[in-house]
């Protein structure tokens, strides 16, 4: 297991929410990506292929997510100060072998300007 800080901008703020970007190498074809807040699994997305190369995408923990050919984005809405924490992208690579797990993350700072509904 590889632990490290994300070497890219992991948090993208918009409209009182945040897009958390979890990248994976282009070569990875089948994987599970989990978003962890501290040690708690917030979201996950699994991409696999069957024996006829049919692709299946499944989410056990429901979050709004978006898959591209080298990243999974998880979206959190209605931000408040309780969202401030360490967030980790936990990537399990099934294909290509060998099986490998990598963990990258960063701290989500919440500033007043990023909150959804500020009191005037």
């Amino acid at each position: 297991e590889i632990n490290g800080s994300a070497n890219y901008e992991m948090f993208i703020f918009h409209n009182g929410g945040v897009q958390i970007l979890c990248k994976y190498p282009d070569i990875v074809q089948q994987f599970k990506m989990q978003l962890l807040k501290g040690g708690q699994i917030l979201c996950d997305l699994t991409k696999t292929k069957g024996s006829g190369n049919t692709v299946s995408i499944k989410s056990l923990k429901f979050c709004h997510s978006q898959l591209s050919n080298n990243s999974v984005s998880f979206f959190l809405y209605n931000l408040d100060h309780s969202h401030a924490n360490y967030y980790f992208c936990n990537l399990s690579i099934f294909d290509p072998p060998p099986f490998k797990v990598t963990l990258t993350g960063g701290y989500l700072h919440i500033y007043e300007s990023q909150l959804c509904c500020q009191l005037k």
Epitope: T46, T48, G50, G52, N53, T54
Partner: antibody, heavy 117, light 111 residues
Framework: EVQLVESGGGLVQPGGSLRLSCAAS????????MDWVRQAPGKGLVWVSN????????NFAPSVKGRFTISRDNAKNTLYLQMNSLRAEDTAVYYC??????????WGQGTLVTVSS | DIVMTQSPDSLAVSLGERATINCKSS??????????LIWYQQKPGQPPKLLIF???TRETGVPDRFSGSGSGTDFTLTISSLQAEDVAVYYC?????????FGPGTKVDIK
């Protein structure tokens, strides 16, 4: 240790039905696509059907489409193959196989289905 | 559907000698740098056993006398030094598209 145990085979008349079961153990069943592969006596391997983790995606060989249905019960770690309108050419050993992301990495011992009058 | 063919249908090789099995697909199995081609061994009365995946990657625990090669439409399984326990039927299989299909098999015996 991964184990797949098929059951439900037997002798059936043409036009009849059978339901095969495959009990899985030793791995997280819901993490894997599962398949049925058959082998007629003295012949080669023929893929029959597969199903994704939660049963949302299903594929069949053209020769069985419309007659066979595949399903799974993840709570019971069991894969099923419902075979209707059976024909003599469906006579075979039916294997349950785990698709390990890039190959069939585990197989059951098989169950023999004989279609004959 | 992709059609898989194998040659020869059968072969007999002396113990310790090399056995070579060929597999041909009706269209290329190469995608994203990977050949979607698998080799299995099946002994009498037993289910198939995985030997090689992605055309050339040996499954864990498979003896290194088994090797796979080839790309695109032409593939080879080589047993570098045949042992008595290698007597079996060998099948290739593609998983490039649905339906996945198997070759007809090659029977390997001792000469």
């Amino acid at each position: 240790e991964v184990q797949l145990v098929e059951s439900g085979g037997g002798l059936v008349q043409p036009g009849g039905s059978l339901r095969l079961s495959c009990a899985a153990s030793g791995f997280t069943f819901s993490d894997y696509w599962m398949d049925w592969v058959r082998q007629a006596p003295g012949k080669g391997l023929v893929w029959v059907s597969n199903i994704d983790h939660d049963g949302n995606i299903i594929n069949f060989a053209p020769s069985v489409k419309g007659r066979f249905t595949i399903s799974r019960d993840n709570a019971k770690n069991t894969l099923y193959l419902q075979m209707n309108s059976l024909r003599a050419e469906d006579t075979a050993v039916y294997y349950c196989a785990r698709w390990g992301h890039y190959a069939f990495d585990s197989w059951g011992q098989g169950t023999l289905v004989t279609v004959s009058s | 559907d992709i059609v898989m063919t194998q040659s020869p249908d059968s072969l007999a090789v002396s113990l310790g000698e090399r056995a070579t099995i060929n597999c041909k697909s009706s269209q290329s199995l190469l995608s994203s740098g990977y050949n979607y081609l698998i080799w299995y061994q099946q002994k009498p009365g037993q289910p198939p056993k995985l030997l090689i995946f992605y055309a050339s990657t040996r499954e864990t625990g498979v003896p290194d006398r088994f090797s796979g090669s080839g790309s695109g439409t032409d593939f080879t399984l080589t047993i570098s030094s045949l042992q008595a326990e290698d007597v079996a039927v060998y099948y290739c299989q593609h998983h490039y598209s649905s339906p996945p299909t198997f070759g007809p098999g090659t029977k390997v015996d001792i000469k």
